[in-house]
């Protein structure tokens, strides 16, 4: 009934932008976006005791305030400051798993290894995962038709700025040994233009972070190459070393077995290299 009250009070804001309005190149706001954000917030705060006191109505107000009535190509990190603040969350700073171009495996891993956290295991990451949203300048409406594409339209769009902002804060909070899962099947295993490469790497705090450990995930069963020697991994090592953070790298040759061994570490086959 709490959710229903919230929806009733705010119905006016959720009309679609008329079809004749500006068309962007990207997909429009995810259907039932406000309801989805609120429902996810309620679910998350019920499950995570340290966030139980968070007021999901205030969280939605802050989320909405970041992009409603604003030009969707002119969003700033400052617009998201209230949401970032309300979503402040203390995760064990030595249990952070970053990822690049391999989200599903990273999430499967933290679902098993419950003491480790990806960004999407935090409240803010969970709220926005796989969602799209944007508004329109000077109207209080959400645009369900189209939203700016990062490449074709503009980079300072609501979704991109959100992920940049929340990723920066997540990286800033990390300490000790930070892990990153990288996709060994891609031509650029480490991509300087990814969120990891452009935001998170540069916001790890050298005074708190001792080591960045990369896990390079192999795609083919017969792939026995040492992908830690890949030129892009060497580039990552160079960037990290210049920031006075140590770097290490491990090949995960068989991700299926890797997950199995995380689930059952006492299995005799888990002593060999995976």
């Amino acid at each position: 009934s709490g959710l229903n009250d919230i929806f009733e009070a705010q119905k006016i804001e959720w009309h679609e932008v008329p079809r004749w309005r500006q068309q962007w190149s990207g997909p429009g706001t995810t259907k039932r976006f406000p309801e989805t954000v609120l429902a996810r917030c309620v679910k998350y705060t019920e499950i995570h005791p340290e966030m139980r006191h968070v007021d999901c109505q205030s969280v939605w107000d802050a989320f909405k305030g970041a992009f409603i009535s604003k030009h969707p190509c002119n969003i700033t990190e400052e617009d998201y400051q209230p949401l970032m603040k309300l979503g402040t969350q203390t995760v064990p700073c030595n249990k952070i798993l970053l990822w690049s171009r391999i989200k599903d495996l990273a999430h499967q891993f933290t679902q098993v290894q419950r003491d480790m956290f990806t960004l999407e295991d935090t409240l803010l990451g969970y709220l926005a995962d796989d969602l799209t949203w944007c508004g329109e300048f000077n109207t209080s409406k959400i645009n369900y038709q189209s939203c700016p594409d990062w490449r074709k339209d503009c980079s300072n769009n609501p979704v991109s700025v959100f992920w940049k902002t929340v990723s920066r804060r997540f990286a800033e909070a990390a300490c000790d040994v930070v892990h990153v899962m990288l996709n060994g099947s891609r031509s650029k295993i480490f991509d300087k233009n990814s969120t990891f490469g452009s935001v998170e790497v540069h916001n790890l705090q050298p005074e708190k972070v001792q080591t960045l450990e990369a896990w390079v995930i192999h795609g083919g069963r017969e792939d026995s190459r040492d992908l830690c020697q890949d030129p892009t991994i060497k580039e990552l090592e160079s960037i990290i070393s210049k920031r006075n953070i140590q770097f290490s790298c491990k090949n995960i040759y068989r991700p299926d077995k890797f997950l199995q061994c995380v689930k059952n570490p006492e299995d005799s086959s888990c002593t060999s290299e995976i």
């Epitope: 966030m51 107000d61 909405k64 990190e77 309300l86 402040t88 969350q89 300490c175 708190k208």
Partner: antibody, heavy 121, light 110 residues
């Protein structure tokens, strides 16, 4: 110069209500979180509520304050209010408003404080 | 509820002494270092001394320093001056943007 000035304190009967004001000057009011913090006589500090209103009001409360206390803001008057209902003897305290440091690296700290206003229940 | 425990509650010192105040949090603060220290004199509002555990606030003398991370923090005054006799509070920042203050440490003249 940044200034915060509280008013509205006084003597009130248990069960009564009071509205405190915090008038701000010397800074761009909309760009900062304003926090109410209280201090019982001879005791430590305790946060009450927070508000920020770049466009609409965003506010939240300490668990114990939810339901009885309401924070609001009048941007035209550069003033933040704390409406306190169903007051109890244990609400007796000096009530301060404070401005949080600006910027994500600095949030969570209070750089500017008012002089406080005493509420006696 | 989050508890911030300061020790000692009272501390007697002479001018020139080195003074250390400890603050322990029942939960880790945000970002492992999101803790502040304030100084308060009788009848006055608190004044920010340190933020993010070890960063000196604007205008604060360098004899003040802070350290610690996670749940244990210290404030040190390397050489106490007459102006430093006051009560000191630690303040943590936590999940959901909640705040908690320590019970205070009164530094008095020996």
């Amino acid at each position: 110069e940044v200034q915060l000035l509280e008013s509205g304190g006084g003597l009130v009967q248990p069960g009564g209500s009071l509205r405190l004001s915090c008038a701000a000057s010397g800074f761009s009011f909309n760009n900062y979180w304003i926090i109410w913090i209280r201090q019982a006589p001879g005791k430590g500090l305790e946060w009450v509520a927070a508000i920020y209103s770049p466009s609409g009001d965003i506010k939240y409360y300490a668990d114990w304050a939810k339901g009885r206390f309401t924070v609001s803001k009048d941007n035209s008057k550069n003033t933040v209010y704390l409406q306190m209902n169903s007051l109890r003897a244990e609400d007796t305290a000096v009530y301060y408003c404070a401005r949080e440091l600006s910027g994500s690296s600095y949030e969570g700290y209070f750089e500017s404080w008012g002089q406080g206003t005493l509420v006696t229940v | 509820d989050i508890q911030l425990t300061q020790s000692p509650s009272t501390l007697s010192a002479s001018v020139g002494d080195r003074v250390t105040i400890t603050c322990r949090s029942s939960q880790s603060v945000y970002g492992h270092n999101w803790l502040a220290w304030y100084q308060q004199k009788p009848g006055k509002a608190p004044k920010l001394l340190m933020y993010r555990a070890s960063n000196l606030a604007s205008g604060v003398p360098s004899r003040f320093s802070g350290s610690g991370s996670g749940t244990e923090f210290t404030l040190t005054i390397s050489s106490v001056q007459p102006d430093d006799f006051a009560t000191y509070y630690c303040q943590g920042y936590y999940s959901g943007a909640s705040y908690a203050f320590g019970g205070g440490t009164k530094v008095e003249i020996k």
